[in-house]
Amino acid sequence: LIIGFGISGRHSITVTTVASAGNIGEDGILSCTFEPDIKLSDIVIQWLKEGVLGLVHEFKEGKDELSEQDEMFRGRTAVFADQVIVGNASLRLKNVQLTDAGTYKCYIITSKGKGNANLEYKTGAFSMPEVNVDYNASSETLRCEAPRWFPQPTVVWASQVDQGANFSEVSNTSFELNSENVTMKVVSVLYNVTINNTYSCMIENDIAKATGDIKVTESEIKRRSHLQLLNSKAS
């Protein structure tokens, strides 16, 4: 969480951002909030990116003002106009690119004053893993697959019964480049599994951490997976 305060002239206002990550090819949100102001016509929201000459986005007098927008963001940005009234200046970024990573500034002007805060935006690819029993294998084998990751992640297996055990000797992980030549499909196979145990396949890079769990018993198979973005720090 980054909290910024205004500078010079008018009073300062508090602006708060949250570091976040974008999944390339999908839409992302750059979070920014400010002290709401009743005089809506005076609210100006500017998004800037370090190293980029033009603006990322500008909202003023109740509408988008995109004449100064940088070419790389053309047609890809929007603020949530109905949320500006409650002090939400978050930016929606469509079709996130790897090159969108960097330091952004959310700069706000209201009738009460000015303020800004920076935001670190990471980009990459992350997806939920799915763990299945591989019935084609000669021994009891689990297969963990996740369709899109970048940068290349690490994959670690764990088990509820054998806590702390190192499964690197009985697992094999491969990374297959996807058709767009950036992201990769992750496939990890775990051998010699036992029934009545819960296994977890953990995939992690510097952007996200995802876990796929599978519990295999005589009568059923239960699966669960979750994904967590790392470094979501507010500022």
Partner: antibody, heavy 116, light 107 residues
Framework: QVQVVQSGAEVKKPGSSVKVSCKAS????????ISWVRQAPGQGLEWMGG????????NYAQKFQGRVTIIADKSTRTAYMELSSLRSEDTAVYYC?????????WGQGILVTVSS | EIVMTQSPATLSVSPGERATLSCRAS??????LAWYQQKPGQAPRLLIY???TRATGIPARFSGSGSGTEFTLTISSLQSEDFAVYYC?????????FGPGTKVDIK
């Protein structure tokens, strides 16, 4: 000096509609949101919805969705709130106010009585 | 929607005494909270916004504090004209919601 002036009291039959108006002086219209808040006899305040003329946005409380319409006429600096399918529980004082997100100037209120 | 609750429902205070009114939100509203005063037969009047900023023309005896989910309105020394109903209102999220009110009456 900002002034918010509302239309007069109304008596309506159940099932009918009521349309009340609110005229704001100064630059209120182009620069601020206009909201409608009602208060049933002896009860608290209830935000019904609001309009942001400069953003071209209206927002209504879920409870009134489909029954309430708020519009604004920038040329006359007047906002209107229409509530349809009236029932006895809609008997209340209806206030027009400048804002949100919070409300700094209020009209005098209009008593709308729904009775057969 | 965010539900606002206020306590106590009624507060009996003698003139000159201090009155402390509480408001609680069902989830964090940061500092996006306003307080209003309403006297019988009158429209509400804005006292405080931003949890602690006094509105124009509001006497210094009124002060607001708190953030997140817990808020307080304090009237340091009650005057006869302060006996009224007080409402809190959140504006963190649509729809804007009010508390049920606290009636401050003469002890």
């Amino acid at each position: 000096q900002v002034q918010v002036v509302q239309s007069g009291a109304e008596v309506k039959k159940p099932g009918s509609s009521v349309k009340v108006s609110c005229k704001a002086s100064g630059d209120t219209f182009s620069n601020y949101a206009i909201s409608w808040v009602r208060q049933a006899p002896g009860q608290g305040l209830e935000w019904m919805g609001g309009i942001i003329p400069i953003f071209g946005i209206t927002n209504y409380a879920q409870k009134f969705q489909g029954r309430v319409t708020i519009i604004a006429d920038k040329s006359t600096r007047t906002a209107y709130m229409e509530l349809s399918s009236l029932r006895s529980e809609d008997t209340a004082v209806y206030y027009c106010s400048r804002g949100g997100p919070y409300f700094d100037y209020w009209g005098q209120g209009i008593l709308v009585t729904v009775s057969s | 929607e965010i539900v606002m609750t206020q306590s106590p429902a009624t507060l009996s205070v003698s003139p000159g005494e201090r009155a402390t009114l509480s408001c609680r939100a069902s989830q964090s509203v940061s500092s996006n909270l306003a307080w209003y005063q309403q006297k019988p037969g009158q429209a509400p009047r804005l006292l405080i916004y931003g949890a602690s900023t006094r509105a124009t023309g509001i006497p210094a005896r009124f002060s607001g504090s708190g953030s997140g989910t817990e808020f307080t309105l304090t009237i340091s020394s009650l005057q006869s004209e302060d006996f009224a109903v007080y409402y809190c209102q959140q504006y963190k999220k649509w729809p804007f919601t009010f508390g049920p009110g606290t009636k401050v009456d003469i002890k």
